[in-house]
């Protein structure tokens, strides 16, 4: 496929990535699926600068990102290394809290109202952000 050189309609370009901000809520798995079907992924935050950009666009609203520990260790959906990467958890988070009464702990990460991260029940219907890199090979064939 060809390299994607500009962002799709309704996506926002920033630092060679394209971002799409939902205005409705979905469970984490549905949000993840939506992004994949758009040839993208849930947002992966790799720097303080990217954190501030996303935070500016989402406002003080709980919003899913592409980080989870549903299979044990924390993982970014695009394979970015969690241990050595950027983190912005709230104090005492993640805590895998079981006291919510919904069964199980908390396995999916989201931006909170102040932008810092919290782990929460993956079934909660939060907004989400998709991201795709401009310089990656697109799945669409080049236009002739």
């Amino acid at each position: 496929g060809s390299e994607r050189t500009c962002c799709p309609v309704n996506w926002v370009e920033h630092e060679r990535s394209c971002y799409w901000f939902s205005r409705s809520g979905k469970a984490w798995a549905d949000a993840d699926n939506y992004c994949r079907l758009e040839d993208a992924h849930l947002v992966v935050v790799t720097s303080w600068e990217e954190q501030k950009f996303v935070q500016h666009h989402i406002g003080p609203v709980n919003t899913w990102m592409g980080l989870h520990d549903q299979n044990g260790p924390w993982k970014w959906v695009d394979g970015t290394d969690y241990e050595t990467g950027f983190k912005n958890w709230r104090p005492e988070q993640p805590d895998d809290w079981y006291g919510h009464g919904l069964g199980g702990g908390e396995d999916c990460a989201h931006f909170t109202d102040d932008g810092r991260w919290n782990d929460d029940v993956c079934q909660r219907p939060y907004r989400w952000v998709c991201e795709t890199e401009l310089d990656k090979a697109s799945q669409e064939p080049p236009l002739l």
Epitope: S22, S24, A29, D30, D32, R36, L37, D39, G66
Partner: antibody, heavy 119, light 112 residues
């Protein structure tokens, strides 16, 4: 038991708009994604797009410029519009329910409706 | 998009024998985030819509006989029908749902 039924004109003229509706019975349309898939005679299957009850959509990139999907939760229906049709759009059109689990495979299908594009 | 290629296009198998259909994707449909393969198999009989047989590459849909089995990972997948029955005559399709969904061209299964 969930049942899906496609309805709409069986004949559409070239350059016009194909419009179909899927009615869901035996269960609520809520909390699922719903897709349209088509199959030209004697050929394979092509996914057109999906919608949920809040109106969130994904479309096949190859058809995106011509497709619009909508939903009417009060009638337990969702609809497809495909503009600027040509003979290549002649096919059996199926509506289908997504299996859930954050995954776009299809566990319930309508029987399909044949749409012919011809003048 | 992801291109799905099935082989063979058609095959004839004796009743009670084993039928094997292969499906190859143009890129991996294994999601490293959850270690799941985003692949499904369907059966379609003449004049009917497709019927879901297998999802997640190897999980059998409720009510599907256990003679149907899915296997494989990454880009290479197989549907195996053990002890073929007359009612298994149909066209079989694989489908990836890792990205915008796409189907294989189909494999027509007949009785020899």
């Amino acid at each position: 038991q969930v049942q899906l039924q496609e309805s709409g004109p069986g004949l559409v003229k070239p350059s016009e708009t194909l419009s179909l509706t899927c009615t869901v019975s035996g269960g609520s349309i809520s909390n699922y994604y719903w897709s349209w898939i088509r199959q030209p005679a004697g050929k394979g299957l092509e996914w057109i797009g999906r919608i949920d009850t809040s109106g969130i959509t994904n479309y096949n990139p190859s058809l995106k410029s011509r497709v619009t999907m909508s939903v009417d939760t009060s009638k337990n229906q969702f609809s497809l519009k495909l503009t600027s049709v040509t003979a290549a759009d002649t096919a059996v059109y199926y509506c289908a329910r997504e299996g859930g689990l954050g995954a776009t495979f299809f566990d319930y299908w309508g029987q399909g409706t044949l749409v012919t594009v011809s003048s | 998009g992801i291109v799905m290629t099935q082989s063979p296009d058609s095959l004839a198998v004796s009743l009670g024998a084993r039928a094997t259909i292969d499906c190859k994707s143009s890129q991996s449909v294994l999601y490293s985030s959850n270690n799941k393969n985003y692949l499904a198999w369907y059966q379609q009989k003449p004049g009917q819509p497709p019927k879901l047989l297998i999802y997640w590459a190897s999980t059998r849909e409720s009510g599907v006989p256990d003679r149907f089995s899915g296997s494989g990972s990454g880009t290479d997948f197989t549907l195996t029908i053990y002890s073929l029955q007359a009612e298994d005559v149909a066209v079989y399709y694989c489908q990836q749902y890792y990205r915008s969904p796409s189907f294989g061209q189909g494999t027509k299964l007949e009785i020899k």
